[in-house]
């Protein structure tokens, strides 16, 4: 039985993001509080009441505001989300008649893939490298004209929260590959994007 309706959101890094809570069954709160869930105890962010209006905690002053001022429906908006904003948030509707009724909405931050695709001849080998950096970690696949071509993949996590996946296609007879198209496929958040490369003899 859901007393508070919420929806999780996934938004792009450095863009605005909104989280909404709706108190059901025609109840109305006296005060609405938003908190960020933390490991030890939740952190108060902002409150709204008819008596005091919107009160934002100092740590969130330039980061958020309540953009739907209601005691039954409440929305907070982050102006410019960073990786630190990723997590779950509680909306607490304080009613004298029923106590504190809470809901949880989670915010996930994503970064669109940045992809590089290049090739390099070395003696009797041709190495084609496809690298994708994104959040959450992307997946890299190859579409090649023939089977049996080996590839190796390396994953690297960056301090900024993104992950680079680099896949190298090892072609032993590069002459056969000249003039042919190789496709690097990057899968991120359910979407596959093709990156094409035609090999020319250097």
């Amino acid at each position: 039985q859901v007393q508070v309706v919420t929806q999780d959101e996934r938004e792009q890094l450095y863009t605005p993001a909104s989280l909404k809570c709706s108190l059901q069954n025609a109840q109305e709160a006296l005060i609405v509080t938003w908190q960020k869930k933390k490991a030890v105890s939740p952190e108060n962010m902002v409150t709204f009441s008819e008596n005091h209006g919107v009160v934002i905690q100092p740590a969130y002053k330039d980061k958020i505001n309540i953009t739907q001022l209601g005691l039954q429906n409440s929305t907070i908006t982050f102006w410019n989300i960073t990786l630190e904003d990723e997590g779950c948030y509680m909306c607490l509707f304080n009613t004298f008649g029923f106590g504190k009724i809470s809901g949880t909405a989670c915010l996930t931050v994503y970064v669109q893939p940045i992809v590089s695709l290049h090739y390099k001849f070395s003696e009797d080998h041709l190495n084609i490298t496809c690298s994708a950096t994104a959040r959450p970690a992307p997946m890299v696949f190859w579409k090649v004209p023939r089977s049996g071509i080996e590839n190796s993949t390396v994953t690297l996590s960056h301090p900024n929260g993104t992950t680079s996946v680099t896949s190298i296609l090892h072609i032993k007879d590069p002459k056969n590959q000249v003039g042919k198209e190789v496709i690097c496929q990057v899968l991120h958040l359910g979407t596959v994007t093709d990156f094409k490369q035609t090999v020319n003899k250097g």
């Epitope: 007393q3 069954n25 025609a26 109840q27 109305e28 005060i31 509080t33 108060n44 409150t47 607490l92 304080n94 009613t95 004298f96 008649g97 029923f98 106590g99 504190k100 009724i101 809470s102």
Partner: antibody, heavy 121, light 112 residues
């Protein structure tokens, strides 16, 4: 003087429904949410749900969702609880109690005398 | 839901002697408004529950001052300084901070 007067005892058959009333007096009916509490024989108290008389909005304990329906009649300052599809485990004493919508101190401060419901064929 | 655990289950006390009942909650009952919605009720045999104490320690009008409530966060206590015959019955703690409101399992006070 604040009073919560509940309807009399009920003897009902399994599968039937029953509607219990809680008539209030001595205070402003719309200023208090009305709550209902179940007490099976020799057991503890169990919150069923509550209803806000201002708008008729009710909230329920998950366990009683579909079993109990809470309503109010503002004109007579009366709260009602209907119990449906009754079974032997619904045999209990049911209480109404008020809880303020505006004040800190009036939480479950006045209770009805209780209505005994016996489910038996 | 917040679980309210009362101990002991039964308390046998001689008239004139003190008594103490413990109530522990599974979550802190301190609300955002800095109030703690913890009540104590007494249910005498064949009667409705009667509120004795609200907001942890405030006595209802007409309740003798031999009853005292204390505690904070998750640990609460009801004390009777000198038990009298009219005190027998079942004592319940109740929390109204979190939805849904919940009661303790009850402590039966018997007179020795």
């Amino acid at each position: 003087e604040v009073q919560l007067q509940q309807s009399g005892p009920e003897l009902v058959k399994p599968g039937a429904s029953v509607k219990i009333s809680c008539k209030t007096s001595g205070y402003t009916f719309t200023e208090y949410t009305m709550h209902w509490v179940k007490q099976s024989h020799g057991k503890s108290l169990e919150w069923i749900g509550g209803v806000n008389p201002n708008n008729g909005g009710a909230l329920y304990n998950q366990k009683f969702k579909g079993k109990a329906t809470l309503t109010v009649d503002k004109s007579s300052s009366t709260a009602y609880m209907e119990l449906r599809s009754l079974a032997s485990e619904d045999s209990a004493v049911y209480y109404c109690a008020r809880r303020s919508n505006y004040r800190y101190d009036d939480a479950m401060d006045y209770w009805g005398q209780g209505t005994s419901v016996t489910v038996s064929s | 839901d917040v679980v309210m655990t009362q101990t002991p289950l039964t308390l046998s006390v001689t008239i004139g002697q003190p008594a103490s009942i413990s109530c522990k909650s599974s979550q802190s009952l301190l609300d955002i408004d800095e109030k703690t919605y913890l009540n104590w009720f007494l249910q005498r045999p064949g009667q409705s529950p009667k509120r004795l104490i609200y907001l942890v320690s405030k006595l209802d009008s007409g309740v003798p001052d031999r009853f005292t409530g204390s505690g904070s966060g998750t640990d609460f206590t009801l004390k009777i300084s000198r038990v009298e015959a009219e005190d027998l019955g079942v004592y319940y703690c109740w929390q109204g901070t979190h939805f849904p409101q919940t009661f303790g399992g009850g402590t039966k006070l018997e007179i020795k």
